[in-house]
């Protein structure tokens, strides 16, 4: 899947954790469909 960033957003960002994707793990599976 693809995500595009850089569009305006009103969502608030958590101040305790980065909003970036965590490191990949082999438990990560591609969603079916």
């Amino acid at each position: 899947s693809e995500t595009t960033t850089g569009t305006s957003s009103n969502s608030s960002q958590s101040t305790s954790n980065s909003g970036l994707a965590p490191n990949p793990t082999n438990a990560t599976t591609k969603a079916a469909g």
Epitope: S1, E2, T3, T5, G6, Q13, S14, T15, S16, S18, G19, L20, A21, P22, N23, P24, T25, N26, T28, T29, K30
Partner: antibody, heavy 118, light 107 residues
Amino acid sequence: EVQLQQSGPELVKPGASVKISCKASGYEFTGYHMNWVKQSPEKSLEWIGEINPITSDKTFNQKFKAKATLTVDRSSTTAYMHLKSLTSEDSAVYYCARRDYDTSLDYWGQGTTLTVSS
Amino acid sequence: DVQITQSPSYLAASPGETITIYCRASKSISKYLAWYQEKPEKTNRLLIYAGSTLQSGIPSRFRGSGSGKDFTLTVSGLEPEDFAMYYCQQHNEYPLTFGAGTKLDLK
């Protein structure tokens, strides 16, 4: 030792496309997102996007969504970036960089210089 | 997008001196700012991440501080090899964004 070895300089004509490679070694290739960054004198450093080497999920800077295609080949631990419909504004140095969740872009390739000229 | 304003763009100093580079984010990025060093013929080097954490193998004369919107990189007791380009980058949210860079020159 972690290393990201990028392909050599490219001189291409306007309207053409190019594919830059980034061969990773010295770490578990599937454990980190691979990021791509553009460096030009006009705009300094610009983040293009990243790819998850396991799922091939991608996250793009909107500015580059129509310009760049990101892929990986897990068997050769190599990431690729394909740039299409090239113009003089695409002339720049392009870097691959490994992103760790905690530390951000902790290892960088040496850069690939792209020159678009007729 | 989070805009990052880095200053100064140019700095001249002598070995042994202490210098400070500033980065300001257009909105709060918590602690998530990284600093990089760029030198000709070398790969970019991560110095500091999460505002103040020193990357493995980086000398302790490099120090990062700040949170929220305002951050600083201080280099104490400049060594000859420290004269280079420095960039900050937020790693709090997508898209990742960078400061315009600071060129540290030998006075």
